[in-house]
């Protein structure tokens, strides 16, 4: 190999050992029979050398540094050449470095021809191995602007006071052009400006200077985004840290075309703007940091550019001004992540503040719109609290548990609407009365409606789930001792059509001791399946539940248990079941940890089933499933 560097070229070539490998045989640079491991060639020098091994690329790397001085004379602006040409260099991993020094008042602009650049974060690498490392200077301090790969959106980077650009090419890469040019500009009065150009839909992830280390103190950095007018851009912060400011405030500023409030100033912790049409700028402004404990300012963010959807021009009014203690959240429904680009799906408040989820609270009227290619990617969860603090005022008071029509008219599917029902302890209980009798969801008879009511205790220490209930059954009412949550959960988009079937009234009633009482009025010819609360985990310790089962005068009810023994083993206390005829008060008592469960029994009159649990030994929980079937009395039951 022969490398000859022209005089005054300000180029230095350095061949040195790369990352040590575990190769058995060492390799040397051979110059007139001398074996060396490092070779430096300066401007005006010509050197002939060879390598002592077959694969020098496994041992050595080459650095070609060109110093460009714009302080003492005119700068060589224009397209930057790879000098010496890659064809003259040995096939080693090579790094071309251009170090440009300029006055503080001069702006320097790196322009990248297609393919543009894509910034990568710490620990990431470029698929083709070609990386661009760009740094700037503040006085004597080097500032890393970032590391970039090909195939991105970054088209220009403007700096002042100097720039250092390192292009790393793997030994096997055929590239023979730098891919960028340098131009001079007037002072940019900030650390740097990065221009990012979107031709169509896509995303870009960008980082503050020195990321993941701290952004230089009291500096300003700007990103300029070029977005076709027919597309919409949204910004989301992926990661940020704030330093400890002594003076001024760290912030981001947006210059958004058409905005009457430019620049729009946001804190880093704020929701960032979305649904922006056309070009916009984003600037990061640091502060004067506390000398004792500076902390670090850093920011990693994403810009997502996509087509506006039909929905994005539609404004929906969600009027929660007459609601109390209610919150509505629109959020992405959980999905498996796909590798390909997925357009963002945002919900926007007042068309500008867009984010992947949004929570609206009661007491106001909200205007929302959507920036989303497919609204089925979002769903809604609502929580409302109905509480009674004064038992004298609440007793016998009723509330309708209905999803407000404003919410049903939104183009997003309702997932859960939860009512938290709170009562004063040991003073009042609750009764739920459905508009249509309910069926309890069981494996034997699952609910197949578009929605169900999930009823569970709302007492933090109590793990008690009464069950899932849907319209079209035999449960006329559910009484519960204390605080509960009732969640209307939808299972199909057809809920919109079936919404009229929803309707539950809750009333505050005098306190009673049992955890729950189900009033069941079976319909003729249908088998009613009932099961104890907390089916999968077992009825909680010392909990008692009852079923009040009505038997019409001309019918007889068959009560059937689905296993021979309850399976419960009591550690302390008693587990028992009482089956009591309501007319005669005659009762049968069964010890659930001693007795076999009763064989199918026939009841000519309304009756109670009461199940009370002990404190079971672990793994020996109380779970009972039973059914009630009505048949006409005329049938001979013998």
């Amino acid at each position: 190999f022969e490398i000859a560097l022209p005089r005054e070229s300000n180029i230095t070539v350095l061949i040195k050992l790369g990352t040590p490998t575990l190769l058995a045989k060492p390799c040397y640079i051979v110059i007139s029979k001398r074996h060396i491991t490092m070779l430096s060639i300066k401007s005006g020098e010509r050197i002939v050398f060879t390598f002592s091994c077959q694969s020098p690329e496994n041992h050595f790397v080459i650095e070609i540094q060109k110093n460009i001085d714009c302080m003492s004379g005119p700068c060589p602006f224009g397209e930057v050449q790879l000098q010496p040409s890659t064809s003259l260099l040995p096939t080693l991993n090579r790094t071309f470095i251009w170090d440009v020094k300029a006055h503080k008042s001069i702006g320097l602009e790196l322009q990248f021809s297609i393919p543009r650049l894509r910034q990568i974060g710490p620990g990431e690498s470029c698929p083709d191995g070609v990386t661009h490392s760009i740094s700037g200077r503040i006085d004597a301090t080097v500032v890393r602007i970032g590391t970039f790969c090909s195939n991105g959106t970054v088209s220009r980077i403007k700096m002042q006071e100097g720039v250092k650009m390192a292009l790393h090419l793997p030994w096997f890469h055929p590239r023979n052009v730098s891919g960028f040019s340098i131009a001079n500009r007037s002072s940019i009065k900030r650390l740097c400006i990065i221009e990012s150009v979107f031709e169509g839909e896509g995303s870009a992830t960008l980082m503050s200077a020195n990321y993941p280390e701290g952004f230089p103190e009291d500096e300003l950095m700007t990103w300029q985004f070029v977005v076709p007018a027919h597309l919409r851009a949204s910004v989301s912060f992926l990661n940020f840290n704030l330093s400890n400011c002594e003076r001024k405030e760290e912030r981001v500023e947006y210059y958004i075309p058409g905005s009457t409030t430019n620049p729009e100033v946001f804190k880093l912790e704020d929701k960032q703007p979305g649904n922006m049409a056309g070009n916009f700028n984003l600037s990061l402004q640091g502060c004067d940091q506390d000398a004792q404990s500076p902390g670090i300012l850093r920011l990693q963010f994403q810009v997502l550019v996509q087509h506006p959807q039909n929905e994005s021009n539609k404004i929906y009014v969600v009027d929660l001004s007459n609601e109390r203690a209610m919150s509505l959240t629109i959020e992405p429904r959980p999905v498996k992540q796909s590798r390909k680009f997925v357009p963002g799906c945002f919900v926007c408040l007042e068309s500008r503040t867009c984010s992947s989820n949004l929570t609206l609270t009661s007491g106001s009227k909200h205007k929302i719109s959507f920036l989303c290619d497919d609204l089925t990617r979002l769903w809604m969860n609502v929580e409302k609290t109905i509480s009674c603090t004064d038992h004298r005022y609440c007793q016998r008071k009723s509330y309708s548990l209905q999803v407000p029509s404003d919410i049903l008219h939104l183009p997003v599917e309702l997932h859960d609407f939860s009512w938290k029902l709170l009562v004063p302890k040991d003073r009042l209980s609750l009764v739920l009365v459905p508009a249509q009798k309910l069926q309890q969801h069981t494996h034997e008879k699952p609910c197949n409606t578009s929605f169900s009511y999930l009823v569970a205790s709302a007492i933090p220490s109590q793990d008690l789930y009464f069950g899932s209930f849907c319209p079209g059954g035999s449960i006329k009412q559910i009484q519960v001792k204390q605080n509960i949550s009732v969640t209307l959960r939808t299972f199909a988009p057809s809920f919109q059509q079936e919404a009229s079937r929803q309707g539950l009234t809750v009333s505050f009633i005098p306190y009673f001791k049992e955890e729950g009482v189900f009033t069941v009025t079976p319909d003729t010819k249908s088998k009613v399946y009932l099961r104890t609360p907390n089916w999968d985990r077992g009825l909680p310790s010392l909990t008692s539940v009852s079923w009040n089962i009505s038997v019409p005068r001309d019918q007889v009810a068959c009560l059937t248990f689905f296993k021979e023994r309850s399976g419960v083993v009591c550690q302390t206390g008693r587990a028992f079941m009482i089956i009591q005829e309501q007319r005669t008060r005659a009762e049968e008592i069964f010890s659930l940890d001693e007795d076999v469960l009763p064989k199918p029994s026939f009841h000519h009159h309304s009756f109670w089933v009461n199940i009370s649990n002990c404190s079971p030994t672990s793994g020996k929980q109380l779970d009972l499933l039973f059914s009630v079937t009505l048949t006409p009395r005329t049938v001979d039951l013998t």
Epitope: T572, G573, I578, I589, F590, S591, S615
Partner: antibody, heavy 119, light 107 residues
Amino acid sequence: QVQLQESGPGLVKPSETLSLTCAVSGYSISSGYYWGWIRQPPGKGLEWIGSIYHSGSTYYNPSLKSRVTISVDTSKNQFSLKLSSVTAADTAVYYCARDKITVAAFDIWGQGTMVTVSS
Amino acid sequence: DIQLTQSPSFLSASVGDRVTITCRASQGISSYLAWYQQKPGKAPKLLIYAASTLQSGVPSRFSGSGSGTEFTLTISSLQPEDFATYYCQQLNSYPYTFGQGTKLEIK
């Protein structure tokens, strides 16, 4: 009306076995109840001896377990207590009582029978 | 075994007085506690079960409260027939145990 009546010898010699029976009237012994024995030495407090469920499951006071046997005879609607190797310390009024599962208390008691252990 | 400690062991009071007897369990027994009244030469009589439920036929001047380890029996206005010995009993776990008794005497 449910009644319980203890019967058995009032005097037992040391080292012998004390045997008492409790006859239940006005209620079937085989329906959701535990049946227990409790004793009370003269001038002292109450001590639970053991209980039996109608199915035959028994529960004994560990302090007496090695000497006590409780059994049930549903056909005669009665249950029995046997306490072996008695000593003077076993002298007491012996009560039989009904323990309703749903109540978890001895709600009905026999009037008691005094048993003296003496040679 | 669960120990039950009654206090006081002896109590002198007059007709019409309000009296309270305490029963303390050595470990939690939920509400599995019963109170009995015993008169000389007679079998004990159930007054209260499940810590606070009045047995049918028992005058309403008797009341029970508590759960866990601390329980009380209260007689709101003593009647002449209430002078007797009172026992608490736990039926939470075997072996069932009784308190040592509280003798209520006429002052």
